[in-house]
């Protein structure tokens, strides 16, 4: 059933999530800036076709529109999306020494955000079954593909976070 802003989510949880989203957005922006400055890969829209051929997936948030938000479904999609991005970021490992530390921090912050979402779902008695394994992740055949993949994954993640932020801010409104 749809659930609006007057939901059963504690304000402390929502504020924590908003903090974490903005932290990850900052990490993601730093990764994008470094990819642009170091490799002149500045425009994700120019790499969309490559993204299709590499099989870089998108994470849906279809259960989260503010008009008909389904709380359990939305939190579950948030968690699943973060789980997906953990795998995509893992596939980028070894992208380049210059980008390594930024990617490492981004990976951990995404994992910590997934933990926060799961914790709350568990407290509400709606934690889904644990995903046993990651789905098939893109395989990058060259350094260029990995860097281009980095641009696309960062761009997809930022879009996912923008939607997440809007949903969480809507829920946090008194």
């Amino acid at each position: 059933t749809p659930l609006g802003p007057a939901s059963s989510l504690p304000q402390s949880f929502l504020l924590k999530c908003l903090e974490q989203v903005r932290k990850i957005q900052g990490d993601g922006a730093a990764l994008q800036e470094k990819l642009c400055a170091t490799y002149k890969l500045c425009h994700p829209e120019e790499l969309v076709l490559l993204g299709h051929s590499l099989g870089i997936p998108w994470a849906p948030l279809s259960s989260c529109p503010s008009q008909a938000l389904q709380l359990a479904g939305c939190l579950s999609q948030l968690h699943s999306g973060l789980f997906l991005y953990q795998g995509l970021l893992q596939a980028l490992e070894g992208i380049s020494p210059e980008l390594g530390p930024t990617l490492d921090t981004l990976q951990l912050d995404v994992a910590d955000f997934a933990t926060t979402i799961w914790q709350q779902m568990e407290e509400l008695g709606m934690a889904p079954a644990l995903q046993p394994t990651q789905g098939a992740m893109p395989a990058f055949a060259s350094a260029f593909q990995r860097r281009a993949g980095g641009v696309l994954v960062a761009s997809h993640l930022q879009s996912f976070l923008e939607v997440s932020y809007r949903v969480l801010r809507h829920l946090a409104q008194p």
Partner: antibody, heavy 119, light 112 residues
């Protein structure tokens, strides 16, 4: 309640390897990252790295990257830290600590495992 | 890597008196999200470290309110308003803004 119980003290010869375990209970193990921290005798704390059990991904402090291996067994809710090619400066207490965000980060620690490297 | 520097390294205090420990980071720990990613831990003799303060100024669960944390982006202070015998141990500041996480060298608080 959350508990992290580590394996007992070890004495090893230089060049050998050691594997320290950290058994977690009281929470859903794969959901949280597990971090490892070194404390040499009379010294401060040094972050070694972490393992994300849900995807089996480990990340290391550059200083430990060549010799430390972090793993996790979801079926037994146990995290492991293996240190190879031991030398005298590896003599230390090694702690596992549960990750998380905000007030969750390192809110729970194992009791520590003393590893002594001596010929 | 972000370098964390604490002072003093040793702090003898009379019970009931206040105490103050400083910590400096080589890079600002204030993120654009408004959060300062600075933590304080206490390691009592023979024990594992325990979380005291998270995100610069928030008291962890179960920590007495005689402890407080403050600071700016790079300079931080842990204050104990009235030291008690149970407060002895080594205090560490730590950053978790970015990997690798790093700790200060520690400040040993002892009772005079």
């Amino acid at each position: 309640q959350v508990q992290l119980v580590q394996s007992g003290a070890e004495v090893k010869k230089p060049g050998a390897s050691v594997k320290v375990s950290c058994k977690a209970s009281g929470y859903t193990f794969p959901i949280y990252t597990m971090h490892w921290i070194k404390q040499a005798p009379g010294q401060g704390l040094e972050w070694i790295g972490y393992i994300n059990p849900s995807i089996g991904y480990a990340n290391y402090n550059q200083k430990f990257r060549d010799r430390a291996t972090l793993t996790a067994d979801k079926s037994t809710s146990t995290a492991y830290m293996e240190l190879s090619s031991l030398r005298s400066e590896d003599t230390a207490v090694y702690y596992c600590a549960r990750g998380g965000y905000g007030d969750s980060l390192f809110a729970y620690w194992g009791q520590g495992t003393l590893v002594t490297v001596s010929s | 890597d972000i370098v964390m520097t604490q002072s003093p390294l040793s702090l003898p205090v009379t019970p009931g008196e206040p105490a103050s420990i400083s910590c400096r980071s080589s890079k600002s720990l204030l993120h654009s999200n408004g959060i300062t990613y600075l933590y304080w831990y206490l390691q009592k003799p023979g024990q594992s470290p325990q979380l005291l303060i998270y995100q610069m100024s928030n008291l962890a669960s179960g920590v007495p309110d005689r402890f407080s944390g403050s600071g700016s982006g790079t300079d931080f202070t842990l204050k104990i308003s009235r030291v008690e015998a149970e407060d002895v141990g080594v205090y560490y500041c730590a950053q978790n803004l970015e990997l690798p996480y790093t700790f200060g060298q520690g400040t040993k608080l002892e009772i005079k």
